[in-house]
């Protein structure tokens, strides 16, 4: 679709005569008829296949034609066409005398023709005017012409339709050749695809308008490049959504079980060494002079009964001092000036001479110890109870009173509540400090996974538009991962209709 434009510039008829040679009375009141048709090697009469146009009376005899409206007519003259411009044409321009006001062909005498010119040739679409001048024996006509495309038509033949738009169906203007030129922020064949916020993750993010970044389920952050861990994940991270990969020192399904109590809580006091011995369990190895589960109690150096042979111990600032009974000497009263003749062995101990009677040794009955069998055996001095167990002397033997969660002669065994397989329906059992916890498979719940609950949340195919469904096993819910172009909790909305703000 386009327009053939003809601009009449000057008509000369100095003698004011008709084509027949007869003069006009009082002068030639001149108007023009134009016929535009397909190319003919010899221009002949016949239908004006590309259109016709007539002007009002533009002047008398000789005159110049103004560039704008003239007496209600238009200059340049417009000959619109609704087809592909063929590139060639034939043009007939007739100048007529109008004796009266009626310019219809049937109202004019047949000899009212002043002049007729006919041209043909090739003409490309363009903004530039072609100037021409046609002369006959009595008249001269100067004019120019061109072909331009109608609004929204482009290309060499005005055959390419392109209408700029900025709506759901496209965001573009038109180039001179009719190709689309996308508005800033849009791309794609029809400029319908927004260009997301720079850096927006290609898979995890999308956008419905330029320079935004909307996150798919399980992703967050300005560029949708940070995954959201499993709901309930306490001390863990993820590399894909809903994971819970535990930080060092933490365990369990939700990374909430403390496997490094020593580091996280520093329970051992007074410079003691802490050793992890299971979930929320530890053992403190005390420095000399300290005791207690957490080495919180300061020991008197005399508590270890360092003085032998009935020597009495006195605490001093820099240690201790032994007061020896008669017949003994040395730092710990370990040297004797006695012999078996002095009956030095107490509590039924038997005396044996050594070094030709210069010394002796006592052989003690059970439950007694010391150089002279003077000490009752304290079987707890070696601190035999593990995991913070309390040692108790019971006559000739000893026993360990264990902390909750431990058992065995020396509290060396961790009580496993899971040993009897208490979790039903394939539930996973986790030992806790004061009991156990069952992690139930999908479809079961309850303290022991004994209650049958809902089936796979994705079984009902809740996601639309070929979205991928993921089941959140901890909540029996589903999450839809939408394909490009769709949003919504079930991927039910096309991107062009973004969900409205909740308020």
């Amino acid at each position: 679709s386009g327009v053939f434009q003809l601009q009449l510039q000057e008509f000369i008829n100095e003698r004011g005569v008709l084509a027949s040679g007869r003069p006009c009375e009082p002068g030639c009141r001149t108007f023009f008829r134009v016929c535009l048709k397909h190319f003919q090697a010899v221009v002949s009469p016949g239908p004006c296949t590309f259109g016709t146009v007539s002007t009002p009376v533009l002047g008398t005899n000789s005159f110049a034609v103004r560039d704008d409206s003239s007496g209600g007519g238009r200059n340049p003259l417009q000959l619109p066409f609704n087809f592909t411009w063929p590139g060639t044409f034939s043009l007939i321009i007739e100048a007529w005398h109008a004796p009266g006001d009626d310019l219809r062909p049937e109202a004019l005498p047949p000899d009212a023709l002043i002049s007729k010119i006919a041209i043909q040739g090739s003409l490309a679409v363009g903004q530039n005017w072609l100037l021409d001048e046609q002369t006959s024996t009595l008249t001269r006509l100067r004019y120019s012409y061109r072909v331009i495309c109608s609004d929204n038509y482009y290309g060499d033949n005005c055959s390419r339709l392109c209408k700029k738009r900025n709506d759901h169906f496209g965001h573009y203007v038109c180039q001179p050749d009719g190709n689309l030129s996308c508005l800033p922020g849009w791309t794609g064949e029809y400029c319908q695809q927004p260009i997301c916020l720079s850096g927006c993750h290609e898979q995890n993010g999308y956008c419905s308008k330029p320079a935004e970044c909307l996150c798919r389920p399980g992703w967050q952050g300005r560029l949708c490049n940070e995954c959201i861990p499993h709901n309930g994940c306490r001390h863990g991270t993820c590399s894909t959504p809903w994971q819970c990969t535990c930080d060092e020192g933490w365990g369990g399904l939700f990374c909430d079980q403390d496997l490094n109590y020593c580091t996280h809580h520093s329970p051992c006091k007074n410079g003691a060494t802490c050793s992890n011995s299971g979930q929320r369990s530890y053992t403190c190895t005390c420095r000399p002079g300290y005791t207690g589960v957490d080495c919180e109690l300061e020991l008197s150096e005399c508590d270890s009964n360092p003085c032998r042979n009935g020597g009495s111990c006195k605490d001093q600032e820099d240690g201790y001092h032994c007061l020896c009974p008669p017949g003994y000497y040395g730092l710990h009263c370990e040297h004797s000036t006695l012999s078996c003749a002095d009956s030095p062995c107490f509590n039924g101990g038997s005396c044996r001479e050594r070094n030709q009677g210069a010394n002796y040794a006592c052989e003690c009955p059970p439950n007694f110890t010391g150089s002279n069998c003077e000490k009752k055996v304290d079987r707890c001095t070696s601190n035999p109870c593990a995991n913070g167990g309390q040692c108790l002397n019971r006559g000739p033997s000893r026993m360990c009173r264990c902390r909750p969660g431990f058992t065995g002669t020396y509290c060396e065994l961790h009580v496993s509540d899971c040993a009897r397989n208490p979790c039903a329906h394939g539930g996973t059992c986790h030992d806790l400090e004061n009991g156990l916890m069952c992690t139930c498979p999908a479809g079961f719940s309850g303290r022991r996974c004994e209650v049958r609950t809902s089936i796979d949340a994705c079984a009902s195919s809740p996601c639309f538009n070929r979205a991928t469904c993921y089941t959140d096993l901890s909540t029996d819910t589903f999450v839809c991962n939408c394909p490009y172009g769709f949003v919504g909790s079930r991927c039910e909305f096309p991107v062009g209709l973004p969900p409205s703000f909740p308020w």
Epitope: L197, A211, E212, C213, L214, C215, Q220, G221, R222, L223, E226, I228, P229, N231, G232, C233, R234, P498, P499, F501, P502
Partner: nanobody
Amino acid sequence: EVQLVESGGGLVQPGGSLRLSCAASGFTFGNYDMSWVRQAPGKGPEWVSAINSGGDTTYYADSVKGRFTISRDNAKNTLYLQMNSLKPEDTAVYYCATPRGWGPTGPHEYGYWGQGTQVTVSS
């Protein structure tokens, strides 16, 4: 059930201060980015500030930069907004929300959001 409950709003004179709180429950608060959004009477919602899940990265709208401070306490499941040098144009209902979409200046789509708390700045 996910719940975000804002508090701390009220009437304050221009130049004054307020501290808003948002208590979260029903989801693992420490795993989510959080933001404050406000809506003035007769206007659309306006993003105010945002903070990442760990609390070490913060974002502010130009209109509040230098006056407002966003923070969070993951142990207490609580988000805060300290508002200083308040102006009459800060009058709005303030919401806390989890952002799920960002534009060139800040978040503009949200997953969870609260019921809001009214802040009025007037002499």
